[in-house]
């Protein structure tokens, strides 16, 4: 019987973690890092963290910004350190969005 193919170990990245999901840690490890901004009841909520499984982040990261939410994703250690997600505003067109541009 042939040996099983070795499982490919996905690369894990260290990411800045900010927000309720981080508990009392300021970093996390995952296959992608993200920085997000969402508007809840008129309040801006900034979060940073990890997408643990690549598939988990794939859809979210491909979603174009909307007036209520924006997510920026990256792969690399601490790549979300200096990234702040921005909401689009009406004006210049943004790829995949309806006539919005970044602030």
């Amino acid at each position: 019987m042939e040996d099983e193919e070795p499982k490919v170990n996905p690369k894990l990245y260290m990411c800045v973690c900010e927000g309720l999901s981080c508990g009392n840690e300021d970093h996390c490890e995952g296959q992608q890092c993200f920085s997000s901004l969402s508007v809840n009841d008129g309040f801006r909520v900034y979060q940073k963290g990890c997408f643990q499984v690549y598939e988990q982040g794939k859809m979210t990261c491909k979603t174009p910004p909307s007036p209520g939410q924006a997510v920026e994703c990256c792969q690399g250690d601490w790549c979300n350190r200096n990234v702040t997600a921005r909401l689009p505003t009406k004006g210049k067109s943004f790829p995949g969005s309806q006539n919005f541009h970044l602030e």
Epitope: V16, D26, E29, V53
Partner: antibody, heavy 119, light 112 residues
């Protein structure tokens, strides 16, 4: 190459405090979390806590919360651990260790600081 | 806290022989990100511990292929084939899935 150079052995009196240092070289200091580990004579290893040199964020083992204080000096790429109210139970070797990326655990260790608490 | 139970405490082996060390955790070491943060270290006499295996089965750079790690969930094993004199020392498992991080109590590998 990566090196963590710790301060020298110390003989201290009960009730005193001690501050030990861990100078990092061979990598970008603010990109790797620094942990501290205690090894009592002839015993296993105990995790004390960590500090994120970039943010200064810390996390402590509950057991050492009132005993240890972790700080860093980014300008000199040095991590520090202060141990207070020393007792004979604190006599041990203390290691600073670097937590590697890509889930590698503690990839580099300092040479250790032997602390002896005795009157 | 997660308790790491390591066995045996002492392991006498013949040079060129095989050795197996077990580490059991009191709860699953599978992290919310799907990874299992179980690592193995060797502490040679008078030295600092050194990383052998990370995340259950990955050899750290420079570690010979005589060392291998396996396991899942709560049950892990470090195997050493063709034991050489430089392999002697204390072996420790460490879990870094849960805070506080916890080590096994150690296994002393010695010549029979």
């Amino acid at each position: 190459q990566v090196k963590l150079l710790q301060s020298g052995a110390a003989l201290v009196k009960p009730g005193d405090s001690i501050r030990m240092s861990c100078k990092a070289s061979g990598y970008t200091f603010t990109d790797y979390i620094i942990h501290w580990v205690k090894q009592s004579h002839g015993k296993s290893l105990e995790w004390i806590g960590y500090i994120n040199p970039y943010s200064g964020g810390t996390n402590y083992n509950e057991k050492f919360k009132s005993k240890a204080t972790l700080t860093v000096d980014k300008s000199s790429s040095t991590a520090y651990m202060e141990f207070c109210r020393l007792t004979s139970e604190d006599s041990a070797i203390y290691y600073c260790v670097r937590r590697g990326h890509d889930g590698t655990g503690f990839d580099y260790w300092g040479q250790g600081v032997m602390v002896t608490v005795s009157s | 806290d997660v308790v790491m139970t390591q066995t045996p405490v002492s392991l006498p082996v013949s040079l060129g022989g095989q050795a197996s060390i077990s580490c059991r955790s009191s709860q699953s070491l599978v992290h919310s990100n799907g990874e299992t943060y179980l690592h193995w270290y060797l502490q040679k006499p008078g030295q600092s511990p050194q990383l052998l295996i990370y995340r259950v089965s990955n050899r750290f750079s420079g570690v010979p292929d005589r060392f291998s790690g396996s396991g899942s969930g709560t049950d892990f094993t470090l195997k050493l084939s063709r034991v050489e004199p430089e392999d002697l020392g204390d072996y420790y498992c460490l879990q870094s899935t849960h805070l506080p991080l916890t080590f096994g109590s150690g296994t002393k590998l010695e010549i029979k």
